[in-house]
Structures are given as structure tokens and as C-alpha cells.
């Protein structure tokens, strides 16, 4: 049935970048400016997405593909196809309703987006703390004594707890 219909339907011959123009005896007309059709046989062209405000154009619209947006510096994409832009924070911070706030002691964020997460609890894996965490970085867990072999790092005892934000150098 599909094959029969396509043989009878002149619109099926219209390639991507065109539309089947009912006003012109169903001939294939190019998509007007600022519109596109990504598949053949379309009866209309879709309006191109416009990247305005906090959005910026990552890929221009063409007759066969929609524009793609990303976010201006200081913001990052959220959602499918970058449907939203969210403010960046610094490493060691998280975005709250009141803006970017430092991670609380015992938590960290090593990215410019997302939330502060608790440091890894090394003892859950039977390991010791090799390097203490900061607000920017997670704790590093060392091998358990049974895992140590010649040439491996020895486990150093945890240093005294640091004030958040004081990164060990």
C-alpha cells in the first residue's frame, strides 16, 4: 500500500530542503528563508530555531537542517537540544535560588554546574583516606593494606580537617 501510494503521490519526490507546494500543483518548491525540511515529502517547511539572548548559534540553519544553539560564556546547556541555559558557578560552588554558593564543609563540586556532593567515604570500600577533600575536590581513597605491593603508594594518614576552600597544594 505504501509503495502504491508513493507512486501516486507526487509529494514523495520532493527532497529535503523543499516542500510540496499545494498552491502550485504540488510541485517541489525550495524552503523559504529561515525555514527547513530535514526529510523528503514534506508539505511544509519548519521555521528555523533562532538563538537569541543567552543562546548563541552553534550551527546555522540550512534548508535541510535546523539551527543548533548553545549558551553564551558563563552559562551552560540544560535539556534536550540545549532547550535552556543555566548560569555557571565556580568549581567549589553550587547554584542556588540566591546565586552561586560555596560548598559546605564535607562536600565538593569539581564542575561549573551541578550540586555539591558529599566526599567519598573511603571506609565503605575498606580503604583509607590518601588525600583529604576540599570544596573543589573529592577525597582520594588509598588501597587497603592488603592491596599494597612493592612499588605502590603507601597510605598516608588523613591530615587534620581543613577549612573549606583551602585547597592543598
Amino acid at each position: 500500500f505504501e509503495r502504491t501510494r508513493s507512486l501516486q503521490d507526487p509529494c514523495s519526490n520532493c527532497p529535503a530542503g523543499t516542500f510540496c507546494d499545494n498552491n502550485r500543483n504540488q510541485i517541489c518548491s525550495p524552503c523559504p528563508p529561515n525555514s527547513f525540511s530535514s526529510a523528503g515529502g514534506q508539505r511544509t517547511c519548519d521555521i528555523c530555531r533562532q538563538c537569541k539572548g543567552v543562546f548563541r548559534t552553534r550551527k546555522e540553519c540550512s534548508s535541510t537542517s535546523n539551527a543548533e544553539c548553545d549558551c553564551t560564556p558563563g552559562f551552560h546547556c540544560l535539556g534536550a537540544g540545549c532547550s535552556m541555559c543555566e548560569q555557571d558557578c565556580k568549581q567549589g560552588q553550587e547554584l542556588t535560588k540566591k546565586g552561586c554558593k560555596d560548598c559546605c564543609f564535607g562536600t565538593f563540586n569539581d564542575q561549573k554546574r551541578g550540586i555539591c556532593r558529599p566526599w567519598t567515604n573511603c571506609s565503605l570500600d575498606g580503604k583509607s583516606v590518601l588525600v583529604n577533600g576540599t570544596k573543589e575536590r573529592d577525597v582520594v581513597c588509598g588501597p587497603s593494606p592488603a592491596d599494597l605491593s612493592p612499588g605502590a603508594s603507601s597510605v598516608t594518614p588523613p591530615a587534620p580537617a581543613r577549612e573549606p576552600g583551602h585547597s592543598p597544594q
Epitope: 551552560h76 565556580k90 568549581q91 567549589g92 565538593f108 569539581d110 564542575q111 561549573k112 554546574r113 556532593r117 558529599p118 566526599w119 567519598t120 567515604n121 565503605l124 570500600d125 590518601l130 588525600v131 573543589e136 575536590r137 573529592d138 582520594v140 581513597c141 585547597s167
Partner: antibody, heavy 127, light 110 residues
Framework: EVQLLESGGGLVQPGGSLRLSCAAS????????MSWVRQAPGKGLEWVSV????????YYADSVKGRFTISRDNSKNTLYLQMNSLRAEDTAVYYC????????????????????WGQGTLVTVSS | QSVLTQPPSASGTPGRRVTISCSGS????????VTWYQQLPGTAPKLLIY???HRPSGVPDRFSGSKSGTSASLAISGLRSEDEADYYC???????????FGGGTKLTVL
Amino acid sequence: EVQLLESGGGLVQPGGSLRLSCAASGFTFSGYDMSWVRQAPGKGLEWVSVIYPDDGNTYYADSVKGRFTISRDNSKNTLYLQMNSLRAEDTAVYYCAKHGGQKPTTKSSSAYGMDGWGQGTLVTVSS
Amino acid sequence: QSVLTQPPSASGTPGRRVTISCSGSSSNIGNNYVTWYQQLPGTAPKLLIYADSHRPSGVPDRFSGSKSGTSASLAISGLRSEDEADYYCATWDYSLSGYVFGGGTKLTVL
């Protein structure tokens, strides 16, 4: 013993597509971040993309953003890299790499480095 | 142009000590852990140092890592001919939301 075996490389024309696979064994694949790293002939290492196992988050190098897609199938212990709109400058050996620090216990793998590497698969983009 | 800067080459004689530097910024080395990799000719890279200064099991204690501010260093003491390889530093860069490698240093044992 950690084993990573890449496949899917080959010769492709500019603008073409290729899908790389990396079969993993010898560790709990679903517990580790996985990356693709490439090395152009006679050049240095360039990180391409990473995928996290817990939230499925993905990150990409600017040079491949919008063209490459990383994915994983934890049931098949396999990592993938879908490469579209390939360019001559994408010509490289592509390595699959396992990060240290098992999740979800470990919150961030960045400290532990990439502690397991495959032998690589060559992708050549040329007309 | 790599985000992390390494000298393209370094050399030393057997038994001596050689140091390879890696320079970055506050968005990468300054606030994140540095890792080092060794790539022998014709082989895949191998993790040498993690978390700035720690060695995985099986890596000889001739290899050591350190970090100060926005720079990191890899030191190899008691140099051997089998140490002839390319060495790369790497870290997470939060402003780029991705990992970054140095350009690599080719070590020649004279």
C-alpha cells in the same frame, strides 16, 4: 585483568560516519567512568569524550562537540563512539580508556586517572 | 596548542635524574588532581602517577610526582634505557568541562 578491545576503525570519506566499539572485560564495567582518547599520527594524546555510569552524563572536547556521541551498554559491557561529519583532522588512533575509582562509592574519578587502556583502532578520514 | 604546557623533549644519561614540567592554570592544575602517563613507542599509554603524587601498584618508586600552584612535575631518578618514552600530564579542567592533556614530552636516554 582489565581488557579493552576497540573495533570499528577504518577508512572513511570526509563528511562520512563511523561507529567505534570497545568491548570491556575483567572489571565491573557498570561501575566506572569511560573515556575515548585519540592520537593523530606523530602527535600527542587528545581527550575526546567521557561518560559516567551512574547518571549517564557525557562530556566532549570542543573539537568534536555536536559531531560525536559517546554511549554505553552496561548489559553488554561495551562503550561506543558514534562519529558523524568526519573531517581529515579526525584521523587518529582512537583509544578506549577506563577511569579509576569505582562508582557509586567514589563520587569523582578525576583523581585516579585512566588506569586501563585498549590498544586502539585507527580511523582514517580521506577522500 | 595544548591547555597544559610541557617541554617537547627532555634527556638524561643512565642513572641520573630528570624532571618533566607541566604548566596549567587555576581552572585545571590549580584546583584539580594531576595524573601522568607513559607511552612507550608503538604501545598504548600507561598510568604512571595519580592524584598528583601517588603511584599505582607496580610502578617503580623511581617515578615521583609533585604539584605546586598551577604547575606539576614528574621526576624520574635512576634513569634507565627502558624509560625512553613519551610522557603526558593530564587533569580535569572545570571551565572546559573536560579532561585536558599536555602536549607530551619525549624523553631520550643518552
